[in-house]
């Protein structure tokens, strides 16, 4: 029969290095009789036999950690006791070795130029990983603005446009290397106007192009404001190249205005805005159409359809890039202005405007427009539209613009040919001939120096004294 023997640990525990998720085993070989009870502790806390993370075999002599976690790090001890003599103990350390792991990777960042950007990169690993950064395809060099912090994060002071790009952090130790996903650093730049629109002084009915160039990141949008409201007409062409937007507003000028270019871009929930303004003022509308070249053709437009003589040829002024279009838009704009005038004035003014903008034309080697006869112009001015005309002259002389008849392309009556001198040299307004049959009384107009008779106008008076000397802009 065997003699009782106190436990002796024949293979003391050693330090074990283990990788996360791998198996780690401690061996505690004991010689004794009778067979001892062996218990295991980790950091002096008993490991329970039924803990499924461990396997205890060979009568307790073999402790296996089935899948090592970084929290398993610590001092493991085995204690053997069989009641003979004292209990014996042996201890060894578990060092959990860990390939680098990025626990807080960097994320995409949008940052306004001049501010500070921090790209996080928190890592785990044993040995402790070193952290470096790559921008694009190259290792990022630290400098006075750019530093890798103790935590691994990348800090950039006073962010510049050239800092924009793709970044990734690299965590490295003796066991391996970990790379973060590529993240984008976007540097946002407040909208700024590089080229402001220029002011213009042009004739009525001219085309003007206002140009505004802006830069920013993201590329700004450009909007145009006319006298405080969104631009209602005109065409806008935009071109974007290298963060620069070039906007061109083409206008058909029928009234003066203040045009503002507004460049806007968005930074998160906030907007940045830059503004620049230009004025468009109107010079004298145009010289006599006899001085301008043109051609005779049928009127195909809509506005003056009911006013002009059917099938007649009208004069198109080739000082416009597209005469037919330009004159039609001009008359359309003019008619909109006439919405504000009296019912007596409006049809007469429409007849005057249509026959002035689309003058009857004699084709030939040199197509010649036929201006309106002075007497008909004066009839509109001093009979049908006397009140409106006086108001207009007062406003235009002060350089003001109001709705009604201001800045309309109306002729200067005193400069028109008289039908008394040459009835074939000027155009009659059929509307006024028709109205004389229906109108029996006209507003009484007195003139200090009666000078011109308006033939057959009106039916109730044999002659009507008017002054041809009114100036008209």
């Amino acid at each position: 029969e065997k003699l009782p023997k106190a436990p002796v640990i024949t293979t003391p525990l050693e330090t074990v290095d283990a990788l996360v998720e791998e198996v780690a085993t401690f061996m505690c070989a004991v010689e004794s009789y009778p067979q001892p009870e062996i218990s295991w502790t980790r950091n002096k806390i008993l490991i329970k036999l039924f803990d499924t993370r461990y396997s205890i075999r060979e009568n307790g002599q073999l402790l296996t950690i089935l899948s090592v976690e970084d929290s398993d790090d610590g001092i493991y001890c085995c204690t053997a006791n069989n009641g003979v003599g004292g209990a014996v103990e042996s201890c060894g350390a578990l060092q959990v070795k860990m390939k680098p792991k990025i626990t807080r990777p960097p994320i995409n960042v949008k940052i306004i130029e001049g501010l500070k950007a921090v790209l996080p990169c928190t890592t785990m690993g044993n040995p402790k990983p070193s952290v470096s950064w790559i921008k694009g395809d190259s290792a990022l060099r630290e400098n006075s603005r750019i530093a890798v912090l103790e935590s691994g994060s990348l800090r950039i002071h006073n962010v510049q446009k050239e800092d924009a790009g793709q970044y990734r952090c690299v965590a490295k130790n003796s066991l391996g290397t970990a790379y973060s996903k590529l993240v984008k650093l976007e540097v946002e730049v407040f909208a700024r106007i590089l080229r402001a629109p220029e002011s213009h002084n042009v004739t009525f009915g001219s085309f003007v192009t206002l140009r505004c160039t802006a830069i920013g990141m993201p590329v700004p949008t450009i909007s145009w404001i006319e006298n405080g409201n969104a631009v209602s007409s005109g065409s806008i062409q935009e071109n974007v190249k290298d963060r620069v937007i070039d906007s061109r507003l083409q206008l058909f000028i029928t009234k003066p205005g203040l045009y503002t270019c507004i460049a806007t871009n968005k930074h998160g929930e906030k907007f940045s805005t830059a503004k620049a303004a230009a004025t468009v003022s109107i010079a004298e509308w145009s010289k006599s159409q006899k001085e301008s070249k043109g051609y005779c053709a049928q009127y195909r437009g809509e506005v003056c359809d009911a006013v002009l003589v059917k099938d007649s040829l009208v004069f198109f002024n080739t000082s416009y890039p597209d005469p037919e279009e330009a004159q039609e838009l001009l008359i359309h704009t003019a008619w909109n202005e006439l919405k504000a005038v009296s019912p007596l004035c409006r049809p007469a003014a429409e007849a005057l405007l249509c026959n002035h903008l689309f003058q009857e034309c004699s084709p030939g080697v040199l197509p010649t427009p036929m201006p309106i006869c002075r007497e008909y112009c004066l009839a509109v001015k001093e009979l049908f539209c006397a009140k409106e005309w006086l108001a207009m002259e007062g406003k235009t002389h002060r350089g003001l613009y109001r709705s009604g008849m201001h800045f309309l392309p109306v002729p200067e009556c005193s400069k028109l040919p008289s039908m008394h001198q040459d009835p074939t040299a000027c155009t009659r307004l059929p509307y006024l001939d028709y109205k004389k049959e229906n109108i029996t009384t006209f507003p009484s107009i007195t003139s200090s120096k009666p000078s011109v008779d308006i033939p057959n106008l009106p039916a109730s008076t044999s002659s009507f004294a008017v002054s041809p000397a009114y100036s008209m802009t």
């Epitope: 005779c296 049928q298 195909r300 809509e302 279009e325 039609e328």
Partner: antibody, heavy 121, light 112 residues
């Protein structure tokens, strides 16, 4: 790039109705006159109707007056042709066409691919 | 009723010059009819060549030119090429009681 896309064609019985639409893109629709032009199978082009930029006037070929209505919705960049009391002779490919300027009778400078209208019992 | 007349067919040799005309059954074609010319190949939508007598549409080669010859509108193709083989239509603005736009019957051009 100017694009005109017609839709709404199909087979309809004599006396029936159809509404053609033309969706416009690539230009400022409200600045241009528009037209409908048709082409019967194996035949030549035939102007049907025109409308200026503002939509304030409308013009029609004599044989469709009173039966067809052209209209436009500048806010939707869309041209329409409402065709009522259709006849066998209205069978054709209907083209939507853009005018070169604001007026209804400028040159036709851009065309859609057309939509076929068949009037048959 | 305005009737616009065109030659039904025409042929030209490659490299040759051809002039297609467009007339009115009653009266002369003038610049006031704003003659336009269109080209159409089978199965395709028409394409604008010339507008308002002699203005070339953008992208149209300068081999194509428009004019008024006598009492007709004319489309001249110089240095004809195989892919010029198409139907050619003229369109005229006309005012006879009401505004109208009238196409000719078209000319089938063959490049031999």
């Amino acid at each position: 790039e100017v694009q005109l896309l017609e839709s709404g064609g199909g087979l309809v019985q004599p006396g029936g109705s159809l509404r053609l639409s033309c969706a416009a893109s690539g230009f400022t629709f409200s600045d241009y006159g528009m037209s409908w032009v048709r082409q019967a199978p194996g035949k030549g082009l035939e102007w049907v109707s025109a409308i200026p930029w503002s939509g304030g006037s409308t013009y029609y070929k004599e044989s469709v007056k009173g039966r067809f209505t052209i209209s436009r919705d500048n806010s939707k960049n869309t041209l329409y042709l409402q065709m009522n009391s259709l006849r066998a002779e209205d069978t054709a490919v209907y083209y939507c066409a853009k005018r070169s300027g604001r007026i209804a009778f400028g040159a036709l400078d851009a065309w859609g691919q057309g939509t076929l209208v068949t009037v048959s019992s | 009723q305005t009737v616009v007349t065109q030659e039904p067919s025409f042929s030209v040799s490659p490299g040759g010059t051809v002039t297609l005309t467009c007339g009115l059954s009653s009266g002369s074609v003038t610049s006031s009819n704003y003659p336009d010319w269109y080209q159409q190949t089978p199965g395709q939508a028409p394409r604008t060549l010339i507008y308002s007598t002699d203005s070339r549409h953008s992208g149209v080669p300068d081999r194509f030119s428009g004019s008024i010859l006598g009492n007709k509108a004319a489309l001249t193709i110089t240095g004809a090429q195989a892919d010029d083989e198409s139907d050619y239509y003229c369109g005229l603005y006309s005012y006879s009681g009401s505004k109208n736009y009238v196409f000719g019957g078209g000319t089938k051009l063959t490049v031999l």
